[in-house]
Interface confidence: low
């Protein structure tokens, strides 16, 4: 069937457009092209004599029309008046006629738009700014965009006139950015060149800076205002409601007790007329003398004794603060303040309450520190702790065990061997240890001022044959994307090798996989929920090779950003609200809801009969899992229209 | 300059049909939604609904469904109210009605208001 | 239907005064609109989605509330404010007006 293709179907004014025939048929004498849908003689464009090659103009020719062989008409130079429909109006050599009609769009090449503002100087939560994207060009589509981005949605935006108008009600500082519109046709797409908008605000209340309000005589004072405002503020300094200088800045140097009072910055804004003050009370104190700590106990016994440090010398009418390690005092139930803060009781003393410590004597708020004092807290010893950690030794090789404990004064120690006493050393050594090696290794750890006493066994099994390993975890049950999981394959052996599957494979070569300790330690960094596998050890010495039963590790994750299904935003009245949230968590998340921020039921199914438009608003899902500690949430729109609502009445008038 | 010119017979026998034009210029109906609203003497304002003249759409007070029709007339800019089988409970002032926004100015017009008589 | 009552329904102020008129609704509203008639006349919008003030509307009138319960205030009467008021809601269909307050000079 003979058609035409017009290409381009949208053309721009001054381009061109081929009007494209298919499926033209064979043994023609001739064909004609008219203006219009019909043939019609008036309207002829132009007729082509295929025998003679000979084009021939109609009344409708206006020099721009090219006709090819093929009967395809290339029209250039296009003007509005071009759009419509095209006729080819066909006679083959049997002179049967046919024709096809094809048709394009002329639209105007946009020009670069502009914005036309009706207040360049807004005063912040009390002008609205309009917007107009000039010139007004019909079948244009206007667009905005702000700072680059499409408007945000804002009940104080409003689109007008067509999109044509973007008004800011009530403008803040923060509407303070690069407006931009634009102009679209089939054709083309314009945009203006930016405009910034200058709001007027402030000024907010100043701040003085520095806070502090107390200082020492002869020190300087320096005190700053700010206060946010456009135009920049112009400051002002009272003292005790005199005026002293209009700078934003004022320095007073080798300050007096009679520098004493309310000093007051006034900040004002001269376009939008508005004052704002602050007022800070100055107080300039003497100097008291410097103070010393004195203490009951030089050598305190951990978890037996109490120190009380004391703070010199008393003075009446005086403030005492303390400090532990440069910090206030924490709140313990082990220390304890005199009535007059004078005395710091620690009560058990433990080896972290070594210090420093250091008082201060405040006359008012003006400070003097004493110099720090540390105590020599005793403890100890600590169960002492043998390495190496082999607990497997193969026959023939040297056994050397090293003891320690933590004690103040240092330890003693002693060895035992299957309760046999050995040796008053540190370290333990045994040559070319056999099976009748095998037993318990005792160290014992003694601290002569304390008097107490603290062991440690450990049992040696001398063999060649490793028993079947266990796995043993850092953590059972970690959290996605914040913790690792070091397994370590047990007992730990001389001369083993250690091997590692996962869910029957061997590792995968991934840079949150890390080998150690021999390989004996396997440990994922930064879990993921797909880490979720089996876990199997195996180790191999030269007489024996054996596999751990496998451990799954439990990895804690989500909850992840909810769905709402089912994904409708809009509803007719009358309808049942049936929301369903979902979000991937392990554990199972606890769900909750929010209706316009009022919270509703905990249920993971939300469900309103036979809504209005009343149930309107943010249908908020939240999701919290109470073993990650985790939460989200995902918020959505629900409209609920009246039949034929009125999209006009929604806001306004 | 925006106004809203009502048209329509002022009596109306009982039984019989209120017909009443109002005719917009200075605006496009089609880019807005047209109300008719009406006061009987003395009394307070009765919405009686709209219409969306670019396709017809209306929205009528329950009230009055079954016995009115709002239509428009594009091309004359123009919309009209027809409220059947009147009586003398629908003696009133019937006034046309259109909300405007212009940039932030929500803008308000009403037709002069028509007062129609319902009596034999 | 939502029900609006309007209170009071009618009074009588000197110029200068400051009226309040309240509004109603039997059922929570998102805004309310208020409207001034004077005889005669058609109404004429003063206060748009409860505080705003329509085009060429004097500052002295203001709007608040929330919910069911609505403001409307003239801070200080002037003659020509002789008229009566009326509150609209527009959240539900059909819309509804209050019965109206008018307002007098002592």
């Known amino acids: 069937k003979l058609t035409i293709e017009s290409t381009p179907f949208n053309v721009a004014e001054g381009k061109e457009v081929l009007l494209l025939v298919h499926n033209l048929p064979q043994h023609l004498f001739g064909y004609s092209w008219y203006k219009g849908e019909r043939v019609d003689g008036n309207r002829q464009i132009i007729g082509y004599v295929i025998g003679t090659q000979q084009a021939t103009p109609g009344p409708a020719y206006s020099g721009r029309e090219i006709i090819y062989p093929n009967a395809s008409l290339l029209i250039q130079n296009i003007i509005q008046n071009d759009t419509g429909f095209y006729t080819l109006h066909v006679i083959k050599s049997d002179l049967v006629n046919e024709e096809a009609t094809g048709q394009f769009r002329v639209y105007p090449e946009l020009p670069k738009p502009s914005i036309s503002s009706n207040n360049s100087k807004p005063v912040e939560d009390k002008d609205a700014v309009a917007f107009t994207c000039e010139p007004e060009t019909q079948d244009a589509t206007y667009l905005w965009w702000v700072n680059n981005q499409s408007l945000p949605v804002s009940p104080r935006l409003q689109l007008s006139n067509g999109n044509r108008t973007l008004t800011l009600f009530n403008v803040t500082r923060n509407d303070t950015a690069s407006y931009k519109c634009e102009t679209q046709n089939p054709v083309s797409a314009r945009r203006s060149d930016s405009v910034i908008l200058n709001v007027l605000y402030g000024p907010d209340a100043p701040t003085i800076s520095p806070l502090n309000t107390s200082y020492r005589s002869g020190e300087n004072l320096n005190l700053s205002c700010h206060a946010a405002s456009n135009p920049p503020a112009q400051y002002s300094w009272f003292v005790n409601g005199t005026f002293q200088q209009s700078t934003q800045e004022l320095f007073i140097p080798n300050i007096t007790v009679n520098n004493s009072g309310s000093y007051t910055c006034q900040a004002h804004n001269s376009d939008t007329g508005l004052n704002r003050t602050t007022v800070t009370t100055i107080t300039v104190y003497a100097e008291p003398p410097k103070p010393f700590i004195t203490s009951n106990n030089s050598n305190p016994v951990e978890d037996e004794d109490a120190v009380a440090l004391t703070c010199e010398p008393e003075i009446q009418n005086t403030t005492y603060l303390w400090w532990v390690n440069n910090q206030s005092l924490p709140v313990s139930p082990r220390l304890q303040l005199s009535n007059d803060n004078r005395t710091l009781t620690l009560l058990s003393v433990t080896r972290n309450d070594v210090g420093p410590y250091e008082c201060g004597i405040q006359n008012e708020l003006s400070v003097d520190h004493s110099d720090p004092v540390i105590l020599n807290v005793l403890y100890g010893p600590d169960d002492p702790t043998i390495s190496p950690s082999y607990t497997y030794y193969r026959p023939g090789v040297n056994l050397s065990l090293s003891c320690h404990a933590a004690s103040n004064p240092p330890a003693q120690y002693s060895w035992l061997i299957d309760g046999n006493i050995q040796q008053h050393t540190q370290e333990l050594f045994i040559s070319n240890i056999t099976e009748k090696n095998s037993g318990l290794y005792t160290c014992q750890a003694n601290n002569s001022a304390s008097g107490h006493s603290r062991t440690t066994v450990k049992t040696i099994t001398v063999s060649a044959e490793l028993p079947k390993p266990s796995i043993s975890s850092n953590n059972s049950k970690p959290v996605e994307d914040k913790d690792a999981v070091a397994f370590t394959c047990e007992p730990e052996a001389q001369n083993t090798t250690y091997l590692w599957w996962v869910n029957g494979q061997s590792l995968p070569v991934s840079p949150r996989l890390q080998l150690s300790n021999g390989n004996r330690t396997l440990t994922l960094f930064n879990v993921t929920r797909n880490d979720a596998r089996a876990y199997v050890c195996g180790i191999q010495n030269s007489v024996s090779a054996n596999r751990s039963d496998p451990v799954t590790l439990d990895v804690l994750y989500g909850p992840d950003t909810p769905i709402i299904s089912p994904p409708d935003s809009s509803y007719l009245s009358g309808a049942n609200l049936n929301l369903s949230c979902h979000s991937a968590s392990n554990p199972s998340p606890q769900y909750s809801w929010r209706i316009n921020g009022i919270p509703q039921q905990h249920t993971q199914v939300l469900f309103i009969a036979k809504i209005t438009p009343n149930n309107n608003g943010t249908y908020a899902c939240f999701v919290s899992n109470l073993a990650t500690g985790r939460n989200n949430s995902i918020v959505k729109s629900i409209t609920v229209s009246a039949s034929g609502t009125s999209p006009g009445l929604s806001a306004g008038a | 300059e925006v106004q809203l010119q009502q048209s329509g017979p002022g009596l109306v026998r009982p039984s019989q049909t209120l017909s009443l034009t109002c005719t917009a210029s200075g605006f496009n109906i089609k880019d807005n939604y047209m109300h008719w609203v009406r006061q009987p003497p003395g009394r307070g304002l009765e919405w009686i609904g709209w219409?969306?003249?670019?396709?017809?759409?209306?929205e009528y007070a329950p009230k009055f469904r079954g016995r009115v029709t709002m239509l428009a007339d594009t091309s004359k800019n123009q919309f009209s109210l027809r409220l059947s089988s009147v009586t003398a409970a629908d003696t009133a002032v019937y006034y046309c009605h259109v909300l405007i926004y212009a940039g932030y100015l929500a803008m308000d017009y009403w037709g002069q208001g028509t007062l129609v008589t319902v009596s034999s | 239907d939502i029900q609006m009552t309007q209170s009071p329904s009618s009074l009588s102020a000197s110029v200068g005064d400051r009226v309040t008129i309240t509004c109603s609704a039997s059922?929570?509203?998102?805004?309310m609109h208020w409207y001034q008639q004077k005889p005669g006349k058609a109404p004429k919008l003063l206060i748009y989605s409860t505080s705003n003030l329509a085009s060429g509307v004097p500052s002295r009138f203001s709007g608040s509330g929330s919910g069911t319960d609505y403001t409307f205030t003239i801070s200080s009467l002037q003659p020509e404010d002789i008229a009566t008021y009326y509150c609209q809601q527009r959240s539900t269909y059909p819309l509804t007006f209050g019965q109206g307050t008018k307002l007098e000079i002592k």
């Open positions: 219409i969306d003249p670019e396709n017809g759409d209306t």
């Open positions: 059922s929570s509203v998102t805004y």
